[in-house]
Interface confidence: low
């Protein structure tokens, strides 16, 4: 199979000896060999002078346009040109591929198999971590994010490894050792998952990571409108300020004795200062 140069490599002014590269013929430069080399001396072995630059512009020669395929180098002869072909190619213009598996064209431990048709003399089956027609390109297998939960992916060549963050395990860090399914929250607390973290939502009167610590239920100031909070063995009690009622003192009492349903979330009415 003919070598595949870098995509966009100039077929006239560039060639390659390895797949994916682009080497420039004399007088051309740039990553794709599309930029002519500017010569400050403006000396040229042959050709008319340019009216705009005063430099000599090369005239057509037998090697112009690079008549040698597959990275062959062209040299002028008195009558025409001659191609010097890279290994594995022959013919007047190096157009015939002679590379076979015997030439060992597969890099990085690729397995060479004879091609099924004349256009492909060989096919390389690449090992994990390599790709390209000659297994010349290394694949970044870690870019596929095989490690989860923030695990660090290490490509060791023969295999991938995940280095897990604390609290995670498994070959791909897929197991959260703090997963709610395997976590007990004490004193009636419930486990809550979210944002990759797992915590206990504790019952009233308890706190801490596993709800094992006694907490002050009044610390959250659960009584609205200046109500006074009292901790009680069964929960908490709000003693409401005059003019307010409800378990958390969230409803104002109207002068006529009727209570109004809240027009805003309980404990906070429009215009009321947040206590």
């Amino acid at each position: 199979a003919p070598l595949v140069c870098r995509a966009g490599c100039s077929p006239e002014h560039g060639f390659c000896e390895q797949p994916g590269e682009c080497r420039c013929l004399e007088g051309w430069t740039g990553p794709l060999c599309t930029v002519p080399v500017s010569t400050s001396s403006c000396l040229s072995p042959r050709g008319p002078s340019s009216a705009t630059t005063g430099c000599l512009v090369p005239g057509p020669g037998p090697c112009d346009g690079n008549p040698c395929a597959n990275g062959g180098s062209c040299s002028e002869t008195p009558r025409s040109f001659e191609c010097t072909c890279p290994r594995g190619f022959y013919g007047l213009r190096c157009e015939v591929s002679g590379v076979t598996c015997a030439d060992g064209p597969c890099f990085n431990g690729g397995l060479c198999v004879g091609g099924a048709d004349p256009d492909s003399a060989y096919i390389c089956h690449c090992p994990p971590g390599f790709q390209g027609s000659n297994c010349e390109k290394r694949v970044d297998r870690c870019s596929l994010q095989p490690c989860r939960n923030g695990g660090l992916c290490l490509d060791l060549g023969h295999a991938l490894r995940c280095r897990c963050r604390a609290g995670f395990a498994g070959p791909r860090c897929e197991h959260d050792l703090d997963d709610c399914a395997g976590r007990a929250c004490a004193n009636g607390g419930t486990c809550v998952e979210g944002g990759g973290a797992h915590r206990c939502s504790c019952a009233l009167g308890f706190g801490g990571r596993d709800c094992r610590e006694r907490a002050d239920p009044c610390a959250a100031r659960p009584c609205a409108h200046g109500g006074r909070c009292y901790a009680h063995f069964s929960g908490l009690v709000c003693a409401c300020a005059p003019g307010y009622m409800g378990a958390r003192c969230e409803f104002p009492v109207h002068p006529d004795g009727a209570s109004a349903l809240p027009a805003a979330p309980p404990g906070l009415r429009p215009g009321d200062p947040q206590r």
């Epitope: 994990p128 297998r141 596929l144 994010q145 095989p146 490690c147 989860r148 939960n149 023969h158 295999a159 991938l160 490894r161 395990a169 498994g170 070959p171 791909r172 897929e174 197991h175 959260d176 050792l177 997963d179 399914a181 395997g182």
Partner: antibody
Framework: QEQLVESGGGLVQPGGSLKLSCKVS????????VSWVRQAPGKGLEWIGY????????YYASWVNGRFTISSHNAQNTLYLQLNSLTAADTATYFC?????????????????WGPGTLVTVSS | DVVMTQTPASVEAAVGGTVTINCQAS??????LSWYQQKPGQPPKLLIY???TLASGVPSRFKGSGSGTQFTLTISDLECADAATYYC???????????????FGGGTEVVVK
């Protein structure tokens, strides 16, 4: 197209050996593993073992007891199940199955692509 | 290894009805539970993975729930095409022994009248 195709099944005598192949195409091993699962005629599914080719890990069901071996030839996208010391109880259809492991950071561990299966008959 | 106990072994329901299949794991398997549908002469087909996520192309009539050791597959608005055997499958990883294992339930045959 993502597919797995098993081959190598057939008739084998008790005490004999067989090597099953599974040709994989259409997906990369980096985020997938492959399990071998079998199903005896008229019975349920039974997990045999699993290989995570990218990580070089193999796991087996405890009942396998070293009689079966899973291997992979990553360059040829082929997996193998070597069956040794076969008995009539090993008569089953053997499935090669893709296991979705961790894709784009999310763990699944579901068997999402199944081969058609290859029948192994152990009989004298 | 984890043992998966699937109940009932067989269930019958009418078209348009609802079927519930239960699966119990002998150890905590977190949310690593999948459900499969198998019809005679065919390989199984993935329906649900990670307890409740529908596989591509599976209708929302299939619903998975549960966590830890208890899991349920519910099929509502039953159709004739739902007649099949259903299997649950777990994945368990032991961080202590760095060993992973899969296991299948015994299967539930769903008969649609």
């Amino acid at each position: 197209q993502e597919q797995l195709v098993e081959s190598g099944g057939g008739l084998v005598q008790p005490g004999g050996s067989l090597k099953l192949s599974c040709k994989v195409s259409g997906f990369d091993f980096s985020n997938y593993g492959v399990s071998w699962v079998r199903q005896a005629p008229g019975k349920g599914l039974e997990w045999i073992g699993y290989i995570d080719p990218a990580f070089g890990r193999t796991y087996y069901a405890s009942w396998v007891n070293g009689r079966f071996t899973i291997s992979s030839h990553n360059a040829q996208n082929t997996l193998y199940l070597q069956l040794n010391s076969l008995t009539a109880a090993d008569t089953a259809t053997y499935f090669c199955v893709r296991v979705a492991l961790v894709v784009a950071g999310v763990a699944y561990y579901g068997m999402d692509v199944w081969g058609p299966g290859t029948l192994v008959t152990v009989s004298s | 290894d984890v043992v998966m106990t699937q109940t009932p072994a067989s269930v019958e329901a009418a078209v348009g009805g609802t079927v519930t299949i239960n699966c119990q794991a002998s150890q905590n398997i977190y949310s690593y539970l999948s459900w499969y549908q198998q019809k005679p002469g065919q390989p199984p087909k993935l329906l649900i993975y990670r307890t409740s996520t529908l596989a591509s192309g599976v209708p929302s009539r299939f619903k998975g729930s549960g966590s830890g050791t208890q899991f349920t597959l519910t099929i509502s608005d039953l159709e004739c095409a739902d007649a099949a055997t259903y299997y649950c499958q777990s994945y368990y990883y032991s961080s202590g022994s760095s060993y992973g294992a899969f296991a299948f339930g015994g299967g539930t045959e769903v008969v649609v009248k």
